[in-house]
């Protein structure tokens, strides 16, 4: 988790002087509670946006937006703490909006936005906005949280972001898998324009089960430049196991931009359809 390397992060708007600061996610008001605290944020919205760094790289960011409730507690609102928690790693990053002037009611509802948290493809986050100061230990909570799922690199807009392109998202191998006689599969895919090796992982499963009955890895050496964008054909021999009929083929490249952690592409061959067994014809006809 990190912040986009923007010039200066701003939160000021007409009628409010505000600065964005790094936060330890442990605001002082936790340790020194105040008697009067503001109410919670209203209508917290999280959306996927895209932003360029100063170097011109494109990253997915969480666009966080919320409004204030129209009550007198805005008189005690000193700022907000924005927290993003990556759920699979428990990594948390916070920033603090520090209001340098008092808020006053005006003809429009106060609205705040922040779009500088860089998020990763295919990850889920919990986004929390805490109004400051935080409530006293038994006080009503004054925060709002929402979960936010970032699409993976198959998503059209995500595909062209720097993290996705670095992991090989622009390569479309167009995998085809054909079942041959004598327990064999022919796998065909398009090579990328890089002299790098690939590995094919074949995993076979029984019909309707997720425990594999066979796993086979096949290595494909780096192609020569004249083979770039050509189709590579590989014949894999299956184990002759009864019922081990559903096959998943995964292709992992080793591109220089992602080394041994590149995106995999996969294709699946289903078990052959079993013909419906016809109703047995009775050898006598009932007379009623």
């Amino acid at each position: 988790l990190r912040l986009l390397d923007h010039r200066a992060l701003v939160c000021s708007q007409p009628g409010l002087n505000c600065t964005v600061k790094n936060s330890t996610c442990l605001d002082d008001s936790w340790i020194h509670p105040r008697n009067l605290t503001p109410s919670s944020p209203k209508d917290l919205q999280i959306q996927l946006h895209f932003a360029h760094t100063q170097q011109g790289d494109l990253f997915p960011v969480a666009h966080i937006e919320w409004t204030l409730q129209t009550d007198a507690s805005i008189l005690y609102l000193e700022g907000a703490e924005l927290s993003v928690l990556q759920l699979n790693t428990n990594e948390r990053l916070c920033v603090r909006f520090e209001f340098l002037s008092k808020l006053r009611h005006h003809h429009r509802r106060w609205r705040f936005t922040f779009s500088h948290f860089v998020v990763d493809p295919d990850q889920e986050y919990e986004v929390t906005v805490h109004h400051l100061p935080k409530p006293i230990p038994d006080g009503d909570p004054n925060h709002q949280s929402k979960n936010f799922l970032v699409p993976d690199c198959e998503h059209a807009r995500m595909k062209v972001t720097t993290p996705c392109m670095s992991s090989g998202s622009l390569w479309d191998p167009n995998i085809t898998v054909e079942t041959l006689e004598a327990h064999q599969l022919r796998v065909s895919f398009t090579l990328w324009n890089e002299s790098t090796h690939y590995q094919i992982l074949l995993t076979s499963f029984p019909h309707m089960e997720n425990h594999s009955c066979f796993e086979h890895m096949h290595h494909i050496p780096a192609p020569r430049p004249e083979e770039f964008h050509q189709r590579s054909n590989v014949t894999l021999t299956l184990r002759n196991l009864k019922g081990c009929c559903r096959h998943q083929v995964q292709i992992q490249p080793f591109f220089s931009s992602c080394l041994n952690d590149c995106l995999r592409h996969s294709a699946t061959v289903s078990c052959p359809e079993m013909p419906d067994t016809p109703e047995p014809i009775p050898d006598y006809m009932p007379l009623w």
Epitope: Q199, L201, E215, H216, M217, R239
Partner: nanobody
Framework: EVQLVESGGGLVQPGGSLRLSCTAS????????MAWYRQAPGKQRDFVAT???????NYADSVKGRFTISRDNPKRTVNLQMNSLKPEDTAVYYC???????WGQGTQVTVSS
Amino acid sequence: EVQLVESGGGLVQPGGSLRLSCTASGGVFNGAAMAWYRQAPGKQRDFVATINSSGSTNYADSVKGRFTISRDNPKRTVNLQMNSLKPEDTAVYYCNRPRDNTWGQGTQVTVSS
């Protein structure tokens, strides 16, 4: 979650032998294909050998006839027996479980007189 730990690396003279081991903890082992890769300084990580769930093996051309990959399912280990070692075999050797792209931390092999 599976973890892979390699051992057995070291310094050996050309023509010598070494036996590398990779021990897996956690996750499924018996049914998983396993592989060895190596990475020489400043080079890309390269395939060395693989052993499939059935025990069938596959080798890079550069090590065929010299290296042998084997597995011991009860001990959850994959071994790489390396004979007739050459200076160009010098690299960090990594164990890999392709199923979930898990890698060990690597073990250094140096072939030098």
